[in-house]
Structure formats: C-alpha cells, structure tokens
Amino acid sequence: VPLSRTVRCTCISISNQPVNPRSLEKLEIIPASQFCPRVEIIATMKKKGEKRCLNPESKAIKNLLKAVSKERSKRSP
C-alpha cells in the first residue's frame, strides 16, 4: 500500500530579483513531483550561506539559469 504523502514544498516566498551567478555557492532546481506540484529553485549564496527561493517564472531568474548552464557547459570537457 503506497504511503499517502501531504504536499511538502519548501518555498514560502519567492524572489523575482536577479542574482549574480558569481555570488552563488549552489543552485538547486527541484522539479515538480507528487510531493510538490511546482518547480522550486533554491539558491545558496556564498556570503553567509544564505538560502533564497527564486521565482522560476521570472525573466531575471530564467536568465540566471541560462548563465549558470552556460558556465557549466564551458567547464565540462
């Protein structure tokens, strides 16, 4: 019998503000699932290790994702 799980998203508020990719320690992209019906993007900043929930629909955040994936593809052989 499958366990019934309640919705367990993480982000209570979201930011539309642009983030400098250089200030990022880590960027987590959590796809929608049976536990959370929405995509969640959580940025961990280098300064103080502060976490920020980002708005996946924001133009600034979409640009950030592009910049980060570009940077990653440059690094990979």
Partner: antibody, heavy 123, light 108 residues
Framework: QVQLVESGGGVVRPGRSLRLSCAAS????????MHWVRQAPGKGLEWVAV????????YYADSVKGRFTISRDNSKNTLYLQMNSLRAEDTAIYYC????????????????WGKGTLVTVSS | SSELTQDPAVSVALGQTVRITCQGD??????ASWYQRKPGQAPVLVIY???NRPSGIPDRFSGSSSGNTASLTITGAQAEDEADYYC???????????FGGGTKLTVL
C-alpha cells in the same frame, strides 16, 4: 506604500463562523508568504497560521487546526482566515503579517503588519 | 511543541542599557526575531537573524544569540522604547511558528 488592512471582525456567538480578510497593497502580493497572528485581551502574541505565496503550503497552530482555514486570492491581493466552531478563547485582535525575505527556513520573520481586526466570541 | 520563555517585566533607567532575553530549545537551531508592540499599535519588527535591523530601526537596538538563549539589547534606552517586546522563532521539530510570552519594558 506597503500596507495590510484587516477586516471582517465583530461579535459572534460560540460555535458560529466568521471570515477575516486582509487586503494587501504596495508590494507584489503573489510573491510573499503571509501569516495570521492574534492577541487575546491581556495576553501575548500567538501565531495562528501561515500560507505560501501560491497557497500550496499551509501550516496551523495546534489550537486552531481543523477549525480555521487560511487561504488567499492573488488576483485580488487578499488573504483570508475562515474561522469555524468559534470558542470564547478565540476572542482576540487578529493581525495579518507578511513573511520577510525568501529563505525557506526563515518564514517566521514578519516585516509588515496590519493594524488588526477585533473578533469577540461571546454568548 | 517547544516554547519560548521571556521575563514578564524589565525596567531600565533612561539612557542606560537593558537586555531582554528569550529562552527555548528551538533557538539552538534557528535565530530569533524581535518585535516591539506599543498599546493600540501593530507590532514592529526590530531585529531578525544574527543581528539585522530593518530600515528605520535605530542602531541602539541589537541582537545576539548563545546556545538556547537569544537577547535583545537596547543601548541607551529612550522613553519611546517603553513597550512590550516579543521574540519569535520556529519549532525545530516541526513547522510551527513560536512567540515568547512577551516582556514589558518600563523606562524610568
């Protein structure tokens, strides 16, 4: 400027229902989590409930769980608290407050508060 | 769920320094935030996180934390600082938000 205005309070008999509203202005309401907090006469602040920016997360204090429902309508920039099976101990000023910042662990910071609406439960 | 404990009342002479404390297990895991409430007014956030002040809050207000205790310090208390002060945090074992019972500050 950033503002929250509560309404819907009043005198109600025990066991009855009441719906509070909180109208938000001056900020992008649909990006912010929101709280309800209350203060009973002569008592301290008591957290009631919180809702995420899109309504997918809702947490409640044990004292109201199963009786109160927090909800929001982002198209109307309005937060709601549906209060059912009211008791004398629910008598309080009810405040809505905005979650400060977007750190998922720090949703208990509240940076903007309304002036409150008084709910009196009495027979 | 866990609790936050505050002294019910504290007094300070005008211009002196006062410390208001808040104790609770959740403070080992999460920072406190502090709210000032004056009669008939909405609460105001004065300190959050490690020691952050929202804009408009005077720099005489500061915060600190050690173990299971968070402190709000007012250095050079003014008459207008007379109010009730509440700490808050979140339950380390769940998703509940906690408030302390409040401390009534009297400026003499």
């Amino acid at each position: 400027q950033v503002q929250l205005v509560e309404s819907g309070g009043g005198v109600v008999r025990p066991g009855r229902s009441l719906r509070l509203s909180c109208a938000a202005s001056g900020f992008t309401f649909s990006s912010y989590g929101m709280h309800w907090v209350r203060q009973a006469p002569g008592k301290g602040l008591e957290w009631v409930a919180v809702i995420s920016y899109d309504g997918s997360i809702k947490y409640y204090a044990d004292s109201v769980k199963g009786r109160f429902t927090i909800s929001r309508d982002n198209s109307k920039n309005t937060l709601y608290l549906q209060m059912n099976s009211l008791r004398a101990e629910d008598t309080a000023i009810y405040y809505c407050a905005r979650v400060m910042g977007t750190d998922p662990h720090s949703y208990y910071y509240m940076d903007v508060w309304g002036k409150g609406t008084l709910v009196t439960v009495s027979s | 769920s866990s609790e936050l404990t505050q002294d019910p009342a504290v007094s300070v002479a005008l211009g002196q320094t006062v410390r208001i404390t808040c104790q609770g297990d959740s403070l080992r895991s999460y920072y406190a935030s502090w709210y000032q409430r004056k009669p008939g007014q909405a609460p105001v956030l004065v300190i959050y996180g490690k020691n952050n002040r929202p804009s408009g809050i005077p720099d005489r207000f500061s915060g600190s934390s050690s173990g299971n205790t968070a402190s709000l310090t007012i250095t050079g208390a003014q008459a207008e600082d007379e109010a009730d002060y509440y700490c808050n945090s979140r339950d380390s074992s769940g998703n509940h938000v906690l408030f302390g019972g409040g401390t009534k500050l009297t400026v003499l």
